[in-house]
Interface confidence: low
Amino acid sequence: EEELQMIQPEKLLLVTVGKTATLHCTVTSLLPVGPVLWFRGVGPGRELIYNQKEGHFPRVTTVSDLTKRNNMDFSIRISSITPADVGTYYCVKFRKGSPENVEFKSGPGTEMALGAKPSAPVVLGPAARTTPEHTVSFTCESHGFSPRDITLKWFKNGNELSDFQTNVDPTGQSVAYSIRSTARVVLDPWDVRSQVICEVAHVTLQGDPLRGTANLSEAIRVPPTLEVTQQPMRVGNQVNVTCQVRKFYPQSLQLTWSENGNVCQRETASTLTENKDGTYNWTSWFLVNISDQRDDVVLTCQVKHDGQLAVSKRLALEVTVHQKDQSSDATP
């Protein structure tokens, strides 16, 4: 004769408030004859959850038809779960007896706990932009999860970060928990196109972690480099001077030309190009008239980037006697 086994496959069952919980229980033998009852807890104070023969259990239904002759499935469903339903549930086989039934064997029990998914992580970066080589902090928050055990990881462009601090609150028992983590990230000059990712893994997510992202483009300022050059060729009595503003981010930029200290209001040609790393280049051309009266011309290209202090580069224009003669000759 096969020995009766009471099989409760789930050690832990996580359910959410308002949903229906299914508690599984199967037996391996029809003998001995007698009912299977469900209890919460153990000992004399245990609570009867379901008895097919007697009592009123409006929230409990059976998965199988218990009246069928060879039924070996005694699983139940409990509807409209509330926090009051948490605890360990046991299916218990009784041997039919007289004057009363005798407890014969209990299943190992299934602990029912309230499980709640964490909210989608929200990642927030620094309030102000910072230049490369400096460290910035990003925070990641997720709320409303249970149980308390949770895993949080940080990534930058797919590479896991190690410099972060994480707190889960509250420290004691609670219906739901929150996590907050702060990661320190060193900015690189090419980080305009970089991302930081906060990844949260929790038992309720069934192996599919939640992710929150932030773009480093919101946190970085790459200051420009300036170069002012005089073009060797000239057009008539004009010399072309170029100001190249390289590798800056964000795009916000103001460029002004000064001639011998006087700001020039006239239009200048310019082009803006985007580099592969997300930074920008700006090139501005300035045409200077050459005449015999102009022995010394000092040109200044001044750039104000993203509200920062202006930076400038000067060029003392080299106008050879030959050039001046040529320009004089060209003047009608």
Epitope: A116, A120, V122, T139, E141, H143, G144, R180
Partner: nanobody, 118 residues
């Protein structure tokens, strides 16, 4: 640590008004939708109203529509519930909480008792 503190409850006659406030701390308040729920004596939690993170959109249960107004001040990390034309059936403990993307509610405050009685 996430903290929610409700205030402004009290005893009021039918037809009267109350304004509840919920001060939030320990999380980035402006990034989260917020909600008010209530629990009447001997009953389960009942949803009352939601407000989006930016404050632009609000939602109300049919039982309070036209009488209650939810609002928020992200600068003060506070959400409010203005309750007008109160009825005895509005008697309950009122709780505020944050909402995640799926609409799941996370509370944590002690609640504010509102009693409507003549």
């Amino acid at each position: 640590q996430v903290q929610l503190q409700e205030s402004g409850g009290g005893l009021v006659q039918p037809g009267g008004s109350l304004r509840l406030a919920c001060a939030a701390s320990g999380f980035t308040f402006s990034s989260y939708d917020m909600s008010w729920v209530r629990q009447a004596p001997g009953k389960g939690l009942e949803w009352v109203s939601d407000i989006k993170s930016g404050g632009g959109r609000t939602y109300y249960a049919d039982s309070v529509k036209g009488r209650f107004t939810i609002s928020r001040d992200n600068a003060k990390n506070t959400v409010y519930l203005q309750m007008n034309s109160l009825k005895p059936e509005d008697t309950a403990v009122y709780y505020c909480g944050s909402l995640d993307n799926s609409g799941a509610y996370t509370g944590g405050g002690q609640g504010s008792q509102v009693t409507v009685s003549s």
